[in-house]
Amino acid sequence: QQWELQGDRRCQSQLERANLRPCEQHLMQKIQRDEDSYGRDPYSPSQDPYSPSQDPDRRDPYSPSPYDRRGAGSSQHQERCCNELNEFENNQRCMCEALQQIMENQSDRLQGRQQEQQFKRELRNLPQQCGLRAPQRCDLEVESGGRDRY
């Protein structure tokens, strides 16, 4: 019980320190791109609500550095996302909480059941794409009241 409380506290502080925004950016851009390739309305980057120009007072720590040579846009967001998720690798329950937080943060922006399912599918694949161990059981349903927390 004591260990679990400490574990929960540690996870909470890790979640508070984490910036999961790059994960959200990467996933939204990916599903929008996938929709484009199926002939939906084009997704204009200038309409991206995450565009750094929307937040002029804050230096975006996710802007390119001289060491970033692997293309801009979504792959850069994905690399930043991987670095954030990497902090949770040894705590599978906390990794799940991070994925749930991403799902919750974006649920209002997802249009329709199909987009929601696609977002969820991509979200589940995120850890593996970063070479990280994915949580075995992780309920990403936003609607359900009592979620399985791991």
Partner: antibody, heavy 116, light 108 residues
Amino acid sequence: LVESGGGSVPPGGSLRLSCVASGVYFSDWAMNWVRQAPGKGLEWISSISGRGANIYYAESVRGRFTTSRDNSQNTVFLDLTDLTVEDTALYFCAKTPLLTRAFDVWGQGTAVTVSA
Amino acid sequence: DIVMTQSPSTLSASVGDRVTITCRASQSVNTWLAWYQQKPGKAPRLLIYKVSTLESGVPSRFSGSGSGTEFTLTISSLQPDDFATYYCQQYNIDSRYSFGPGTKVEIK
């Protein structure tokens, strides 16, 4: 990336190696230590995540070497203890983007010599 | 742990030759496979990551291929600057990183 702290020590001795990064958002990157014994191949010895929550070691150094980082100083450290002659090597630090899991930026290395 | 082997250990070749180096893993490494070039007294240089993706600034005469447990690095036309030692490296969630023993490419 610039390493420092190498030198000669007797068996059983200790050293602290440093690796300073410049021109990079340091806390965004997983960092690693890789060593190369004279005339031998490359051996990965340790990795540390961007904020230091996860640290990994090769079996050959686990329990003797400790990796840490100070993001305010853009520095990663490798503390070497209980050194043996087998630890004599050139020690490199290297950056790893997690999407590639490859070492894309390396330091020039710092030499550690363990001899009686 | 995943053990990496490379063949040949030494390769004698001439400028203009097509050179192939093979790397084998003791178990599948998915796509987490990279190749490096190292010259004496220097740090290694990343050439290829994720099996076949050329690192920025690396000449197109270098290419990588393979899957599962067997991978190859090919230099289509060996140049004077290419005489060096080449290492493969894998990443695995459980055993983390490991390198092959290296292949020295020397002048015939």
